[in-house]
Amino acid sequence: KGMHAAQPAVVLASSRGVASFVCEYGSSGNAAEVRVTMLRQAGSQMTEVCAATYTVEDELAFLDDSTCTGTSSGNKVNLTIQGLRAMGTGLYICKVELMYPPPYYVGMGNGTQIYVIDPEPCPDSD
């Protein structure tokens, strides 16, 4: 009756502060327009990292100033977050909304724990 979004439990960000994972949703509907929102949970607080609406025929497009990029294929969305630092370590939740045509459905993943390790500064060479 509802919809579920699946995402990996853990992802390790690259040394450049980039993390990618796939968010996959399943539904009984046949959505043409989907909205994907990335949420970061810290304690009981949930903040929106980025969001995008896409049509199933088109590429996923985030806002120009967004820290996220993404591509979509069918009911799978490959999300990439950039500019992560150690303080960005946390639980990132994928929220998927089937916006059009009706009926509207929403699903949330269980979250992906992204670990970010800031690179050690290079030692000075004499």
Partner: antibody
């Protein structure tokens, strides 16, 4: 703050026409599909039409087919409902709402009477 | 017009608990979600319970929902004066291919 403000409701004679507008603010209007819902006096709510975020695809109930047209102008953050061949049974308060039902407008009253 | 059945009115005293039922069929509530809306006099509806069964942002946990078969129930505990309003349920009908709503229930605080 998200706001949806409808306007254009009026008293009109049967077979007449009206255009309702819904001006959106406080969110990225062009990213959201939208709906029109109406409520006849003393009755329940009735979904009548929806439109996708880009305005290229619409859906509606049979009762308004060929008479009402839903459209949008994303540059003006505005949703429209063009109502032609109005009937007494179209008398209602008309609401616009985001397709995820998170926000609704306050409504505009359309009265069809001779 | 209204496909889902709701009682026309319910009432309760401050602090009490009330329930509002919403009965549909196997093609709507039995097969789909149920959302709930609150409508204060002279205003547009406000979403109380989203299609995923969770409370909308800012809605207190005094509002809860349950479902059994083709019937959904909204429970409001610890009634407050500001709860006096009309309450509507909605679902998607897979036979009619449209959103369906209840006729609305008027809650009166005694």
């Amino acid at each position: 703050e998200v706001q949806l403000v409808e306007s254009g409701g009026d008293l009109v004679k049967p077979a007449g026409s009206l255009r309702l507008s819904c001006v959106a603010s406080g969110f990225s209007f062009s990213s959201y599909a939208m709906n029109w819902v109406r409520q006849a006096p003393g009755k329940g709510l009735q979904w009548i039409a929806g439109i996708n975020s880009g305005g290229s695809s619409t859906s509606h109930i049979d009762a308004i087919k060929g008479r009402f047209t839903i459209s949008r102008d994303n540059a003006k953050n505005t949703l429209y409902l063009q109502m032609n061949s109005l009937r007494a049974e179209d008398t209602a308060v008309y609401y616009c709402a985001i397709s995820n039902w998170a926000y609704w407008g306050q409504g505009t009253l359309v009265t069809v009477s001779s | 017009q209204a496909v889902l059945n709701q009682p026309a009115s319910v009432s309760g005293s401050l602090g009490q608990r009330v329930t509002i039922s919403c009965t549909g069929s196997s093609s709507d509530i039995g097969k789909s979600y149920v959302a709930w809306y609150q409508q204060l006099p002279g205003t547009g509806p406000r979403t109380l319970i989203n299609v995923d069964g969770n409370r909308a942002s800012g809605v207190p946990d005094r509002f809860s929902v349950s479902r059994s078969g083709n019937t959904a129930t909204l429970t409001i505990s610890g009634l407050q004066a500001e709860d006096e309003a009309d309450y509507h349920c909605s679902s998607w009908d897979w036979s009619l291919h449209t959103y369906v709503f209840g006729s609305g229930t008027q809650l009166t605080i005694l």
